[in-house]
C-alpha cells in the first residue's frame, strides 16, 4: 500500500482542516488508515483522524482544532496499521480556505433596488471575521450568458444594484463566496444560491 | 479540593537511587499534564520534568537528563520521579505541579496551578 | 534557553504603597496574541510556591485584584497596588512556552 499524491490540506480558520490524499490503489479509508496529528507545541499530545472515502483511492480527514493562531504547525503522519506510509506539516495560516457564507436573502421591495444580505460565515471574534470581502455572482436561468460577478471589496456583507441593471419579468439566482487578503487564501465555496422574480416599473419615456 | 500530595523523599548517597510519588486528588488527572520543579536549599525554584497527559510526551532538564525518569499511572492517579545515579547537587525540595490542559488539541494553559508540600530529598555520604 | 532576568532582587516597601517587580526574557515568549507563556509565583516562608498570574496577565483563582500583571513578548511586569504585610516572601517569574521552563532569580519582598 502507497502514496499516490501526498495529503494536501487547507484550514477554515476556525475548527477543521480538511486534508485530501490519493492512494495507489482502491482503499477502504475508514478501516485501513489512520492520519494522525499533533501540534508543535509544548506538552501537546498527538490526536487522530480516521478518514473516509473521496472516490476509489481517494481519502478525505477532517481535523478537528480548537481554533487557529498564525504560529500554529502541525505534525502528519499517515498510518496503515503499524507502517508509516508518509510524513509531513502543515501550517493552517499559510492554507485557508474560508467558510462559505451563509443566509444569502435578496430583497426586492426597495424602490427598484436589488438588496442581497448574507451572513459572515465566522463569529466577531475570529481574525477572519473582519477581513473577509465577497464575490456574488448573479445569473440568468434563461439565458447562460446573462452572468455576472459583482466583487464587494468593503466587509459589510451585503450588495445594493439597481433591479434595471438586470432584465425584467424573469428568474435570476444569486450565490456568494469569500475571501481574505490577509492571508492569501482561497476562494470558499459557494454559498447556497437563492432565486427570486426580477421586475421592475419601466420607466416612463417621455416624447 | 485539588490536591497533590508527594512522597518518597530521604537520604541517600551519591550514586544511588529514589523514587518519588504524587498522588493527584479533585481532578480528572489523565486530562494534564504534571510537572516536578526543585528547590536547593537556600536557592531558586529549578524546572526538572514534564509529563503530558497521556505519557506521551516527556522534556526534561539538561541537569537530570539520562538520570531521571518521570512517569505516571493515570490508573493510580500518580505521577513518579524515578532518579539514579544521584548527586550531592540534587540535594533539594522536590515538588510536583499540576500542569496544562493536555488533552486539547492546543493545551490550554493555566499556570502551575496546584502544588504539593515538597519532598525533601538530601544526598549526602 | 530562554533566560529570565527579574529586577530589583530585593524590594523594601512601606504597607499601602505599590510595588512592581520586573522580568525580562532573552527570547520572546509570545505564542500568539494575548498568548504571552510568563506566569509570576509567590514563595512565602516555609511554604510551596502559589500561582498568582498565568499568561502574562491572568489573575489565578483566589489571587487578590491587588496583584496585577502586564507586558508582552520580553517584557513583564507584577504590580502591587498595595503591600499587605502577608505579601512578603520570593517572587518569581517563569517561562513555559519552550522547554526547559526557566524561572527568575526571585525578588525578596520585605515590609520596611
Known amino acids: 500500500m502507497k502514496v499516490l499524491q501526498e495529503p494536501t490540506c487547507v484550514s477554515d480558520y476556525m475548527s477543521i482542516s480538511t486534508c485530501e490524499w490519493k492512494m495507489n490503489g482502491p482503499t477502504n479509508c475508514s478501516t485501513e488508515l489512520r492520519l494522525l496529528y499533533q501540534l508543535v507545541f509544548l506538552l501537546s499530545e498527538a490526536h487522530t483522524c480516521i478518514p473516509e472515502n473521496n472516490g476509489g483511492a481517494g481519502c478525505v480527514c477532517h481535523l478537528l482544532m480548537d481554533d487557529v493562531v498564525s504560529a500554529d504547525n502541525y505534525t502528519l503522519d499517515l498510518w496503515a496499521g503499524q507502517q508509516l506510509l508518509w510524513k509531513g506539516s502543515f501550517k493552517p495560516s499559510e492554507h485557508v480556505k474560508p467558510r462559505a457564507p451563509g443566509n444569502l436573502t435578496v430583497h426586492t421591495n426597495v424602490s427598484d433596488t436589488l438588496l442581497l444580505t448574507w451572513s459572515n460565515p465566522y463569529p466577531p471574534d475570529n481574525y477572519l471575521y473582519n477581513h473577509l470581502t465577497y464575490a456574488v455572482n448573479i445569473w440568468s436561468e434563461n439565458d447562460p450568458a446573462d452572468f455576472r460577478i459583482y466583487n464587494v471589496t468593503y466587509l459589510e456583507p451585503s450588495l445594493r444594484i439597481a433591479a434595471s441593471t438586470l432584465k425584467s419579468g424573469i428568474s435570476y439566482r444569486a450565490r456568494v463566496r469569500a475571501w481574505a487578503q490577509c492571508y492569501n487564501t482561497t476562494w470558499s465555496e459557494w454559498s447556497p444560491s437563492t432565486k427570486w422574480h426580477n421586475s421592475y416599473r419601466e420607466p416612463f419615456e417621455q416624447h | 479540593e485539588v490536591q497533590l500530595v508527594e512522597s518518597g523523599g530521604g537520604l541517600e548517597q551519591p550514586g544511588g537511587s529514589l523514587r518519588l510519588s504524587c498522588a493527584g486528588s479533585?481532578?480528572?488527572?489523565?486530562?494534564?499534564?504534571m510537572t516536578w520543579v526543585r528547590q536547593a536549599p537556600g536557592k531558586g525554584l529549578e524546572w526538572v520534568s514534564s509529563?503530558?497527559?497521556?505519557?506521551?510526551?516527556?522534556y526534561y532538564a539538561d541537569s537530570v537528563k539520562g538520570r531521571f525518569t518521570i512517569s505516571r499511572d493515570n490508573s493510580k492517579n500518580t505521577l513518579y520521579l524515578q532518579m539514579n545515579s544521584l548527586r550531592a547537587e540534587d540535594t533539594a525540595v522536590y515538588y510536583c505541579?499540576?500542569?496544562?490542559?493536555?488533552?486539547?488539541?492546543?493545551?490550554?494553559?493555566?499556570?502551575?496551578?496546584?502544588w504539593g508540600q515538597g519532598t525533601t530529598v538530601t544526598v549526602s555520604s | 534557553d530562554i533566560v529570565m532576568t527579574q529586577s530589583p532582587l530585593s524590594l523594601p516597601v512601606t504597607p499601602g504603597e505599590p510595588a512592581s517587580i520586573s522580568c525580562r526574557s532573552s527570547?520572546?515568549?509570545?505564542?500568539?496574541?494575548?498568548?504571552?507563556?510568563v506566569d509570576w509565583y509567590l514563595q512565602k516562608s516555609g511554604q510551596s510556591p502559589q500561582l498568582l498570574i498565568y499568561?502574562?496577565?491572568k489573575r489565578a483563582s483566589g489571587v487578590p485584584d491587588r496583584f496585577s500583571g502586564s507586558g508582552s513578548g520580553t517584557d513583564f511586569t507584577l504590580k502591587i497596588s498595595r503591600v499587605e504585610a502577608e505579601d512578603v516572601g520570593f517572587y518569581y517569574c517563569?517561562?513555559?512556552?519552550?522547554?526547559?521552563?526557566?524561572f527568575g532569580q526571585g525578588t525578596k519582598l520585605e515590609i520596611k
Open positions: 527570547q520572546s515568549v509570545l505564542y500568539s496574541i494575548g498568548y504571552n507563556y
Open positions: 499568561l502574562g496577565n
Open positions: 517563569m517561562q513555559s512556552l519552550t522547554s526547559p521552563y526557566t
Open positions: 479533585g481532578f480528572t488527572f489523565r486530562d494534564f499534564a
Open positions: 509529563i503530558s497527559g497521556s505519557g506521551g510526551n516527556i
Open positions: 505541579a499540576k500542569d496544562r490542559l493536555s488533552k486539547t488539541i492546543r493545551p490550554r494553559y493555566y499556570g502551575l496551578d496546584v
